[in-house]
Interface confidence: medium
């Protein structure tokens, strides 16, 4: 239960986390299980311990083995085991199964491929991506933070994806690669004319001048993968970005949820420091998909302060 498999390639950086978790203040001791020899914490060593992390900078085939970590607190000790295997680099393009991280599935709507284990490393952009050993090129592929986004996913996009990045440790750079398979799901569903759940048509929302206010535009579109479905806000018939009022911002990205099996999207409009002039604006929640566009209009009204006098 408290044993974890980790693997890497020779001459690349490998960082392993102790399978037993503890507070950052707890001390963690690492040992090489075969010899019971303590792993040093001095960073000048090629293999050293750094709290919950065991670092191989870079890794060598001879580093393979079981490592023991002991998380020590004032009241208890917890022991975990890291089973580390370092492999020789392959001369050909094939990535063997034992070097593959978990398979991820994608669809037209969601095609993110996360770079495995990257959160353990001190890396900086750019993150490079390869499919079946070929560097990915073209506008359909976007390396975004620690994941790859593929636009207009097709069945041909299935395959083995490798991310490559540089880990920096005290000014020294080490290469890291990680590979995982990506499969494409063909989701059968149906779509409907958008149904806006909130706000109600011609809703009046009470707000307090000087306070912050949130408006949520929420709509459902059908079942399964929804093609070109979207929700957004407009101000006086203009895109939020074009309206030019920095206090009024649309939340980045659309949150997807499922209500009674239906695919729904919502978008939050945030108004900071509500002003009198905001009450004069027309706020339109737009929901659209391949069947059309539906628009619900909201206006703001001043919330009357509660009268505490009898």
């Amino acid at each position: 239960k408290f044993s974890k498999q980790s693997w890497g390639l020779e001459n690349e950086a490998l960082i392993v986390r102790c399978p037993r978790q503890g507070k950052p203040s707890y001390t963690v001791d690492w040992y090489y299980s075969q010899t019971n020899k303590s792993i040093p914490t001095q960073e000048r060593n090629r293999v050293f311990a750094s709290g919950q992390l065991l670092k191989f900078l870079p890794a060598a085939v001879a580093d393979s083995g079981i490592y023991t970590c002991i998380v020590r607190s004032p009241t208890f000790n917890r022991t975990g085991y890291a089973n580390v295997t370092i492999y020789k680099k392959q001369s050909d393009c094939n990535v063997p199964d034992y070097l593959m991280y978990s398979t991820v599935s994608g669809s037209e709507k969601n095609s993110k491929i996360y770079c495995p284990t990257i959160d353990l490393y001190n890396w900086t952009a750019p993150l490079e991506w390869f499919k079946n050993c070929q560097a990915l090129q073209g506008s359909r592929y976007r390396a975004h933070k620690s994941f790859l986004v593929i636009d207009n996913v097709m069945t041909e996009d299935a395959g083995d994806y490798t991310c490559k990045f540089i880990h920096n440790e005290n000014g020294a750079n080490y290469s890291v690669t990680a590979t995982r398979s990506f499969t494409v799901k063909d989701e059968q569903g149906f779509s409907l004319f958008p149904v806006i759940g909130a706000p109600a048509q011609n809703e009046i929302k009470e707000v307090e001048i000087g306070k912050n206010a949130n408006l949520t535009c929420s709509a459902c579109f059908g079942k399964g993968t929804q093609f070109l479905a979207a929700v957004l806000w407009q101000l006086n018939g203009t895109k939020i970005t074009d309206f030019g009022e920095p206090r009024i911002q649309q939340e980045e990205g659309q949150n997807q949820s499922f209500s009674n099996g239906l695919a729904c999207l919502d978008m939050v409009l945030r108004i900071a420091d509500v002003k009198e002039e905001d009450l004069l604006l027309q706020y339109d929640c737009l929901a659209l998909n391949l069947h059309g566009l539906r628009r619900h209009t909201v206006r703001l009204s001043r919330k009357n302060p509660i009268d505490h006098h009898s």
Partner: antibody
Framework: QVQLVQSGAEVKKPGSSVKVSCKAS????????MHWVRQAPGQGLEWMGV????????KYAQKFQGRVTITADESTSTAYMELSSLRSEDTAVYYC?????????WGQGTMVTVSS | EIVMTQSPATLSVSPGERATLSCRAS??????LAWYQQKPGQAPRLLIY???TRASGIPARFSGSGSGTEFTLTISSLQSEDFAVYYC?????????FGQGTKVEIK
Amino acid sequence: QVQLVQSGAEVKKPGSSVKVSCKASGYTFTDYYMHWVRQAPGQGLEWMGVIIPVLGAAKYAQKFQGRVTITADESTSTAYMELSSLRSEDTAVYYCAKGWGAFDIWGQGTMVTVSS
Amino acid sequence: EIVMTQSPATLSVSPGERATLSCRASQSVSSYLAWYQQKPGQAPRLLIYGASTRASGIPARFSGSGSGTEFTLTISSLQSEDFAVYYCQQYYSYPWTFGQGTKVEIK
């Protein structure tokens, strides 16, 4: 009245690109999808792709994936369809069409001839 | 993708007669079906959407029916201007697909 006016006929060499424009008037350009459909001589209609100007998002038929790019300029209410790596079988009339799922208004069509 | 199949490929009808055109989908498209008319050298024109709703300005002699996988376009009394090619199109799921067309010619 609502209308879509397309750019004029083009003659192109194989391997080159063509960019067809479609200027919309008489309706709120950003409120509707703009589709592109082509028709080879004596053949039926073939859907190529669609753009939603309000989102700036486009979607393409798998057959044209990687070769077609559909864009929109809100300021001029104009949609564009660019097709690259042209081959002789791309010789066709290219139509823009406004609508959601059904296309209620069509452009007059742009004849693109690909010939060496 | 959903394949749309129209029949017959050609329909020969005399003016004033009734014409019935069929369209079949390879899987259910609910009522998300449109019919278009195209005359030589012209762009297509929308006749019917939602399987049975006439588009703006379309004469009452054009009617659409059906749902799921079987659809029919009926022209109750053919006028000279109705001789053209007719296409059905589904917009139930991506990608949008058209039938191969039915040519209505003068008998």
